[in-house]
Amino acid sequence: VKMAETCPIFYDVFFAVANGNELLLDLSLTKVNATEPERTAMKKIQDCYVENGLISRVLDGLVMTTISSSKDCMGEAVQNTVEDLKLNTLGREICPAVKRGVDLFLTGTPDEYVEQVAQYKALPVVLENARILKNCVDAKMTEEDKENALSLLDKIYTSPLC
Amino acid sequence: VKMAETCPIFYDVFFAVANGNELLLDLSLTKVNATEPERTAMKKIQDCYVENGLISRVLDGLVMTTISSSKDCMGEAVQNTVEDLKLNTLGREICPAVKRGVDLFLTGTPDEYVEQVAQYKALPVVLENARILKNCVDAKMTEEDKENALSLLDKIYTSPLC
């Protein structure tokens, strides 16, 4: 039995970015018909993970897992169920807390992003890593890059693979 | 507001092992009063991640995130809620699907473990990685090591930090 997942293509792209493996990222992005500018934007984010070394990939993976398995995300599922007691209302949609984190990573200030991460993982090393990654992304990505990253996210969230 | 997490110390230990950073692992294990034999057992698992390189850490992180955010885990929360419509029944307990995966990693055969992973992430590269890690752990760990790893897991699951 293949279990239904919460937007698997999102996690595929996230871990491909964090991995620093261009081939893996290209494979994931092809699945959602990413344009060349969208790929360029994602590769700039990937560069930040690579430059920041292994620790950033592991710590950011930890943050993502913590948020994805938090009561905040679980609460979403529960809320839907309380409303109509049907499991299928869980959908395959990504949890709003994860969406918020990603939005803040792209469109929030470093302080705003780190504040969000701190709600889930307050370890100083985790927060410091989050700030370094965020500052790197802000330095590398132009307004246009960020628009392209956001349009790619729209494709991911609305993809049949989500 | 600090969000309640699902057994945060478990994820701390998991990512410390996958990271290959001994210091980070030692810090996490100290929090649950791990004995020397328990530390040795965890370091043998950590060695497998290190030997298998970066890709294994990223892919295993992806598997862990996918399981933790799957409907299987969500379903647990939902089930409890349907029973008494109280959010606090979510507890901070780790999701049974995650527990099952960890148990199979330690006590199952490679086929059994890979079969479990395949329910969540069927990418060939993920399954191949899972098999390599599992074979490595089986080769490195004695009966006694596995007993120690299991006793450490008990400490983690029953810790106030979970």
Partner: antibody
Framework: EVQLVESGGGLVKPGGSLRLSCAAS????????INWVRQAPGKGLEWVSL????????YYADSVKGRFTVSRDNAKNSLYLQMNSLRAEDTAVYYC????????????WGQGTTVTVSS | DIQVTQSPSPLSASVGDRVTITCRAS??????LAWYQQKPGRVPQLLIY???TLQSGVPSRFSGSGSGTDFTLTISSLQPEDVATYYC?????????FGQGTKLEIK
């Protein structure tokens, strides 16, 4: 041309409600965070609220928290500010302003709409 | 919340003068400070962001400096069209507080 146009201002009694709108054009609205900023007659600028492109995060100034609600409809390229329990001190010109993605500052402002709270 | 204090207000200077307006944050905000210009009866316009980066189209006589808690807006040679109220704003995180404004007049 990148443009923001506010509407919905007017005269309202204390305790009353009003809904302001901000229509956007010339840019991909759904990608941008938008602020509401107000300016009381003869006074300085006061930040009121911010809503992110996908509404995933929203911030309010303490002075309006619990009384004002910001929302957006990306399909209509529109932003809204629902103002309840209005007070005399809410009298001001209300501007919507786009926040840039790369530097987080307000680079495009609307012309403003006037709200007067008086009995 | 972080407070933002501007000085002086008001400010009177002659055409051609070098004019300096200061802005102080009650806590460090790195370089997350912007300056806006509002001419009488007009909408505010972004002048400077990231403490010292000039917004496209803004004359080069305007410059900004500072980091942490103390910031400065300088007009190297005041022009008649610079008559306006100038606001600093911290934007590292909400609330995005503005300074009280500095009204600049020509002597």
């Amino acid at each position: 041309e990148v443009q923001l146009v506010e509407s919905g201002g007017g005269l309202v009694k204390p305790g009353g409600s009003l809904r302001l709108s901000c229509a956007a054009s010339g840019f991909t609205f759904r990608n941008y965070n938008i602020n509401w900023v107000r300016q009381a007659p003869g006074k300085g600028l006061e930040w009121v609220s911010l809503i992110s492109g996908s509404s995933s995060y929203i911030y309010y100034a303490d002075s309006v928290k619990g009384r004002f609600t910001v929302s957006r409809d990306n399909a209509k390229n529109s932003l809204y500010l629902q103002m309840n329990s209005l007070r005399a001190e809410d009298t001001a010109v209300y501007y919507c302003a786009r926040r840039t993605l790369s530097y987080y500052v307000m680079d495009v402002w609307g012309q403003g709409t006037t709200v007067t709270v008086s009995s | 919340d972080i407070q933002v204090t501007q000085s002086p207000s008001p400010l009177s200077a002659s055409v051609g003068d070098r004019v300096t307006i200061t802005c102080r944050a009650s806590q460090g905000i790195s370089n997350y400070l912007a300056w806006y210009q509002q001419k009488p009866g007009r909408v505010p316009q972004l002048l400077i962001y990231a403490a010292s980066t000039l917004q496209s189209g803004v004359p080069s006589r305007f410059s900004g400096s500072g980091s942490g808690t103390d910031f400065t807006l300088t007009i190297s040679s005041l022009q008649p069209e610079d008559v306006a109220t100038y606001y600093c704003q911290k934007y590292n995180s909400a609330p995005y507080t503005f300074g009280q404004g500095t009204k600049l007049e020509i002597k």
